[in-house]
């Protein structure tokens, strides 16, 4: 009896793993062995498929063959058993694009309200993956235990810390990844479960800002008890993409090291341009709180915010102010690359009552003065991306005599 | 493979100093941290200290830092652990370790035996 | 200092039983904390890391348990291979410290 070829052949890849399945075409005929040929692009010749020879089952493995995971590949299946059938081609196919990506790793860490996510790609050293490691984004979906009240995060990366949470309670949550720019989305991790600790005595401190004073940044932040010393600690943004580095090597701020008001300043200079975290922990002597929530924190636009400098030139009805850019130690100009809108308020020096106007323009009419009347004004930049939503410190108030009448022009 | 081989055994007399050296294989030290750790005879495990081999920065235990001097040497990929002032007290075997992560020493060098003895 | 305490300086146990280390921090140190196994005459060897997730290569019979101030190593189906002392370390705080150590002994 003539043996049958094989049919339906499905290619499953996920990660570097390379599973073939198939239909057996005659059930009814015993002790039938699959064999698999390969050929790459531009060769005439058929190679034996290594981990796919002479099968007794429908599924076989050839994730030890090496190939060019960009290059397009055709297969073909025969059944034998004392003769053996026709071969059976399958449609070819670039391994890259068929590739699905597989679970990623996850370790959980808890603390009393929040829990830390370390993700790594599910197969360490990916060949499949390797031009695209730092590519990976990774998406969430949490829940309470209790609850199954589920909540999704989009685009995280190999470090994520959730907040916010339940003390002594277990959260469950699942992970995948994904390649935006290969449009590829992966597989859920299986599900993992952590209860968080017991409250602990100290809170981590919060509202933690950075604002720019003369050659220093201010650092600030909020805590609920007195007499404690706080640190504070930074790492490069970029260090919590490093696909599988769960080390992060955080780094003390000299002038914030075991300091004991609820802020520090620290010189310019202590960052080169670029995007940081920056985390406080409180102690008190014996006890220590978490960190508190890490905050982002970019010297570009840090640096930029200063507050406008600006000149007035006074008229009997009105001021007309010149907005310029912000000087730094040696008067020199800050360059600006983010657009900005300036918020001017303005008073009379006799009255506490004080209007505002919000321009983009840098040169701004404040209208309806009266002569000879002594007015202050004051100035402060904010970025225009919502993003960044950043706000610069109000300038030093600046006073001025409008001119007596008729001197509009 | 993973490895940490750690200098051989060394006898020395009290008040003088002596150098450690701890060569990483198989991984870049620059991206993890080297630590130290103290070992008595009979006694438990006692963290010196650890530095950054990527920037040289550095932690100790207060108690140690009159004591020990931890640096690093990236192009050899060697940590150094030295000893001053030393006494029969500082008589142990020292480990050097990898700090990886989560912070855990997930590898140990096979240990330096310090003795000082006059 | 975060101090972690290992209350039972010995513990004895036979073949194929199994016993728990127990390892007290404290104050709250989440879940990070790690166990290695020290057996005589070698350097110690990594077997947990955040409180409860094995080292490749390390027999799944450990399991490592616990958070905030209480932690416990348990070995369940004890070998003598088994018989060595066991140390928990926090890794909460950079300065890192150790508990005293567990000694197991095999009857």
């Known amino acids: 009896k003539n043996l049958k070829s094989p049919q339906k052949v499905e290619v499953d890849i996920i990660d570097d793993n390379f599973i073939l399945r198939w239909n057996r075409s005659d059930e009814s005929v015993g002790n039938v062995t699959f064999s698999f040929d390969y050929q790459k692009t531009g060769m005439d010749n058929w190679i034996k498929l290594s981990g796919c020879q002479n099968i007794t089952s429908t599924k076989c493995n050839f994730s030890s063959l090496k190939l060019n995971v960009y290059e397009e590949i055709k297969l073909r299946i025969r059944a034998e058993k004392e003769n053996t059938s026709s071969w059976y081609e399958v449609d070819s196919f670039t391994p890259f694009r068929k590739a699905q990506i597989g679970p990623p790793e996850v370790h959980l860490e808890a603390e009393d309200k929040a829990i830390v996510i370390h993700i790594s790609p599910g197969t360490k050293d990916s060949v499949m993956w390797a031009l695209d490691g730092l590519s990976f984004t990774y998406s969430l979906v949490i829940w309470k235990n209790s609850s199954g009240v589920e909540e999704r995060i989009e685009n995280i990366y190999s470090r994520h810390k959730i907040y916010k949470l339940s003390p002594e309670t277990t959260y469950c949550l699942k992970v995948k990844a994904a390649l935006l720019t290969s449009w590829k989305i992966g597989v859920y991790s299986p599900v993992h479960c952590i209860k968080t600790t017991v409250e602990n005595e100290l809170p981590p401190p919060e509202n933690i800002e950075v604002s720019v004073q003369n050659q220093n940044y201010v650092l600030k932040w909020d805590y609920t008890y007195a007499n404690m010393t706080f640190q504070v600690q930074w790492l490069h943004a970029f260090l919590k993409r490093n696909p599988g580095n769960h080390l992060y090597k955080w780094k003390q701020i000299p002038d914030c090291e075991n300091v004991k008001t609820t802020q520090c300043v620290f010189p310019q200079n202590v960052f080169q341009k670029g995007i940081y975290l920056l985390r406080v922990q409180a102690s008190d002597g014996n006890n220590t709180s978490f960190w508190s929530e890490e905050i982002k924190f970019d010297t570009e636009i840090q640096a930029f915010l200063l507050p406008p400098v600006f000149n007035i030139r006074s008229l009997s009805d009105s001021f007309h102010i010149y907005i310029g850019a912000p000087k730094q130690s040696g008067n020199t100009p800050v360059i600006q690359d983010y657009p900005l809108i300036y918020e001017i308020i303005f008073w009379e020096n006799t009255s506490n009552a004080e209007r505002k106007i919000i321009e983009k323009k840098t040169d701004v009419t404040v209208p309806n003065l009266k002569p000879l009347t002594v007015y202050c004004v004051k100035a402060r930049a904010h970025t225009m991306d919502e993003k960044l939503n950043k706000s610069s410190v109000f300038s030093d108030a600046v006073c001025e005599k409008t001119k007596p009448g008729n001197t509009s022009k | 493979d993973v490895q940490l081989q750690q200098s051989g055994a060394e006898l020395v007399k009290p008040g003088a100093s002596v150098n450690l050296s701890c060569t990483g294989s198989g991984f870049n030290i620059k991206d993890y941290y080297i630590h130290w750790v103290k070992q008595r005879t009979e006694q438990g495990l006692e963290w010196i200290g650890r530095?950054?081999?990527?920037?040289?920065?550095?932690k100790y235990v207060p108690k140690f830092l009159d004591k020990a001097t931890i640096t690093a040497d990236t192009s050899s990929n060697t940590a150094y652990l030295q000893l001053s002032s030393l006494t029969s007290e500082d008589t142990a075997v020292y480990y050097c370790?990898?700090?990886?992560?989560?912070?855990?020493?997930?590898?140990w060098g096979q240990g330096t035996s310090v003795t000082v003895s006059s | 200092d975060i101090v972690m305490t290992q209350s039972q300086k010995f513990m004895s146990t036979s073949v194929g039983d199994r016993v728990s280390v127990t390892c007290k921090a404290s104050q709250n140190v989440g879940t990070n904390v790690a166990w290695y196994q020290q057996k005589s005459g070698q350097s110690p060897k990594a077997l947990i890391f955040?409180?409860?997730y094995r080292y490749s290569g390390v027999p799944d019979r450990f399991t490592g348990s616990g958070s905030g101030t209480d932690f416990t190593l348990t070995i369940s189906n004890v070998q003598s291979e088994d018989l060595a002392e066991y140390f928990c370390q926090q890794c909460n705080n950079y300065r890192l410290t150790f508990g005293s150590g567990t000694k197991l002994e095999i009857k």
């Open positions: 370790t990898r700090g990886g992560n989560y912070y855990a020493m997930d590898y």
């Open positions: 530095v950054d081999p990527e920037d040289g920065e550095t």
């Open positions: 955040l409180a409860s």
